[in-house]
Structures are given as structure tokens and as C-alpha cells.
């Protein structure tokens, strides 16, 4: 489908001359025909901002140790998270790691494992928590 160009501008470092007033809206990309935009294909590609791209960005496929938190739409990339029982610290590129099964002796669990953090344990006699 061909849709009208956006007249809103967005900063872009890729180009020496940012084509202001020629940007396509989120969920679409530039056509090979000047002045036209093509819609992204749901589940295949996306653009999350006004853009001058000649194709939508490819949707990310979740890794084998991850599950889909939210699917790729024409305006938002796939969101992936670690599968239950595994976690990865925020902003880390490492593989998902198994959650700890329990706290060390003398400590008690105060927080369950989430896809983003391991269980949290605190000393029985103190209120100060720390990750292990």
C-alpha cells in the first residue's frame, strides 16, 4: 500500500542532507518512487519513527533461550525475554542464565526470579538485600 509522506522531521546521522519534509510515518518506509511511502509488512518489518529508509527494519527473532513478550508490529520491534526459570540482567547481551534454586544458609528469599533478575536474598537478621 502506498501512503502519503509525513511532514514531520526526525534527526538522522546517516545522511549528510536530512530530507526534511520527505519522511515516511512510523509503520512505513520510503518507496522507490519519490514522494510515496510503502507500509511495512506486519510481523516482517517495522519502523518506530518517521524515517527516510528504503525498507522497514527487519523484525527480531527471539533466541532459542527466549520467549516473545510482545510480537513485532509495523511500528514496534519484537520484545523478547528469558524463558521462565531463567534470567538476564538488564541491558546485558549474555545468554539467559538459570535462576538460583535457593538462598545460601542464613539468608532468606525476598524476591522471586524474573526474566530480568535472579532471586534476591537477605540475611535473616538484616534488612539489606543483595543479589547472588
Amino acid at each position: 500500500a502506498t501512503i502519503k509522506l509525513h511532514d514531520q522531521s526526525i534527526g538522522t546521522q546517516q545522511w549528510e542532507h536530512s530530507p526534511l519534509g520527505e519522511l515516511c510515518p512510523p509503520g512505513s518506509h520510503r518507496s522507490e518512487r519519490p514522494g510515496a511511502c510503502n507500509r511495512c509488512t506486519e510481523g516482517v518489518g517495522y519502523t518506530n519513527a518517521s524515517n527516510n529508509l528504503f525498507a522497514c527494519l527487519p523484525c527480531t527473532a527471539c533466541k532459542s533461550d527466549e520467549e516473545e513478550r510482545s510480537p513485532c508490529t509495523t511500528t514496534r520491534n519484537t520484545a523478547c525475554q528469558c524463558k521462565p526459570g531463567t534470567f538476564r540482567n538488564d541491558n546485558s547481551a549474555e545468554m539467559c542464565r538459570k535462576c538460583s534454586t535457593g538462598c545460601p544458609r542464613g539468608m532468606v528469599k525476598v524476591k522471586d526470579c524474573t526474566p530480568w533478575s535472579d532471586i534476591e536474598c537477605v540475611h535473616k537478621e538484616s534488612g539489606n538485600g543483595h543479589n547472588i
Epitope: R33, P34, F54, A55
Partner: antibody, heavy 118, light 111 residues
Framework: EVQLVQSGAEVKKPGASVKVSCKIS????????IHWLRQAPGEGLEWMGW????????GSPQKFHGRVAMTRDTSISTAYMELTRLASDDTAIYYC???????????WGQGTLVTVSS | QSALTQPASVSGSPGQSITISCTGT?????????VSWYQQHPGKAPKLMIY???NRPSGVSNRFSGSKSGNTASLTISGLQADDEADYYC??????????FGGGTKLTVLG
């Protein structure tokens, strides 16, 4: 049949500029984006940037920023590519090509040999 | 150094089939189906032979076919003919909104 016809060969000194032209016939000049590419002797192809013939805006990779200018004269259906501050490694055949519907280039101009030599 | 990797040369006899590979990354060949192949005879401009991985423009022989697996695209020419002898270049659109090419493969038709 769409045809892209380019200007003739040029010999330039280092530090000079060159302006290559590309005349489109057989279809509307403004129907598709125009791209510029080059090929050094015995080497592969290198993409230099895109040009919007309606608005006159252009985009090029970082490597050519500040050195390449793409313009047009719609009255004669001609696009131009000017490369400044020429060096010996700019010696190449320069091509214009139209953007095909699938992010490909088709057809191409016949090429313009630019030789940079002192 | 080209962004996409192709073998420098391949050869085959008339009637045989040959395959030329083109290896990139997730950001180009692996990220999109916008892979093209161009044929270039000496002293001539490149000619589009395959677009979108496996589509032939009208007028291109069905002896030319394309495929892709992961980050590697391939061009296969079956029933080799003398005038297939040329340089072949692969190209891909990239997630950086640019185009990259392979270094080219010289095809020699023996005999």
C-alpha cells in the same frame, strides 16, 4: 525503453573537482530515485548515494560526506554528480542507475571514466 | 575490502552448472531479501540478473536462479554458455539504509 546516457571521460588533477551528468529518456525523469555508483579499475562496485529528482535531496554514506553533491536540471531530464577534492584513488568509472522496485539498480548508464592524475 | 564476500573466480564447461556464493551479515544479506545479482561483461555497465534473492527481470534467461540461506546468498547458472563468461556481483540493501556489494566473481567458461 528507459535509457540513461552519461557524459564523456574526464582527466583531472588531484585536488580538482569533476561533474558527471546522466540524462534520462524514455520515461519521466522524476519517476524513480537515481543512484550513483563507481568502480575503480579492476575492482568491485561501490555505492555512492541516492538522489531524489523531485526535491533535489540526496543521501550518501559517511565516506563521501562533504565531497559529493548531487543536483539536477529537470528541464533537460538530467542528474549531476559532482565530486570535489579529487585524489588518485578516485580514479574510477562512475555510473548512474535508477532504483528498481526491489531496492536494486536497473537500468544503468554506460559509465563515465574519471582519471585523476598529476 | 568489500562488505560482501564472493569467490574471486569460478569456472565450468559449456552445459555444466556453477554456483557463486555471496556471504554477508545479519545487517544485510541475512536481514533482508533485497539481494541482487549483476552481470558485467568487460567494458560494459552492470546488468541486473536477479533481484529479491530469486526473481528474474523480464528478458533474463531462466538458466539463472538465486537462493539464500541465512547470511549467504547464491547465484546458480545452469547449462553454461560461452557468453555467460563475465564478472558477477552480488548486492544487498542494509539496515543502515545503504547498499553494499561483493568484490565480484570472474566466471570462466572453459573450452
Amino acid at each position: 525503453e528507459v535509457q540513461l546516457v552519461q557524459s564523456g571521460a574526464e582527466v583531472k588533477k588531484p585536488g580538482a573537482s569533476v561533474k558527471v551528468s546522466c540524462k534520462i529518456s524514455g520515461d519521466s525523469f522524476t519517476a524513480y530515485f537515481i543512484h550513483w555508483l563507481r568502480q575503480a579499475p579492476g575492482e568491485g562496485l561501490e555505492w555512492m548515494g541516492w538522489f531524489n529528482p523531485i526535491s533535489g535531496t540526496a543521501g550518501s554514506p559517511q565516506k563521501f560526506h562533504g565531497r559529493v553533491a548531487m543536483t539536477r536540471d529537470t528541464s533537460i531530464s538530467t542528474a549531476y554528480m559532482e565530486l570535489t577534492r579529487l585524489a588518485s584513488d578516485d580514479t574510477a568509472i562512475y555510473y548512474c542507475a535508477r532504483q528498481h522496485h526491489s531496492n536494486t539498480f536497473d537500468p544503468w548508464g554506460q559509465g563515465t571514466l574519471v582519471t585523476v592524475s598529476s | 575490502q568489500s562488505a560482501l564476500t564472493q569467490p574471486a573466480s569460478v569456472s565450468g564447461s559449456p552445459g555444466q552448472s556453477i554456483t557463486i556464493s555471496c556471504t554477508g551479515t545479519n545487517s544485510d544479506v541475512g536481514g533482508y531479501n533485497y539481494v541482487s545479482w549483476y552481470q558485467q561483461h568487460p567494458g560494459k555497465a552492470p546488468k541486473l540478473m536477479i533481484y529479491e534473492v530469486n526473481n528474474r527481470p523480464s528478458g533474463v534467461s531462466n538458466r539463472f536462479s538465486g537462493s539464500k540461506s541465512g547470511n549467504t546468498a547464491s547465484l546458480t547458472i545452469s547449462g553454461l554458455q560461452a557468453d555467460d563468461e563475465a564478472d558477477y556481483y552480488c548486492s544487498s540493501y542494509t539496515t543502515s539504509n545503504t547498499w553494499v556489494f561483493g568484490g565480484g566473481t570472474k566466471l570462466t567458461v572453459l573450452g
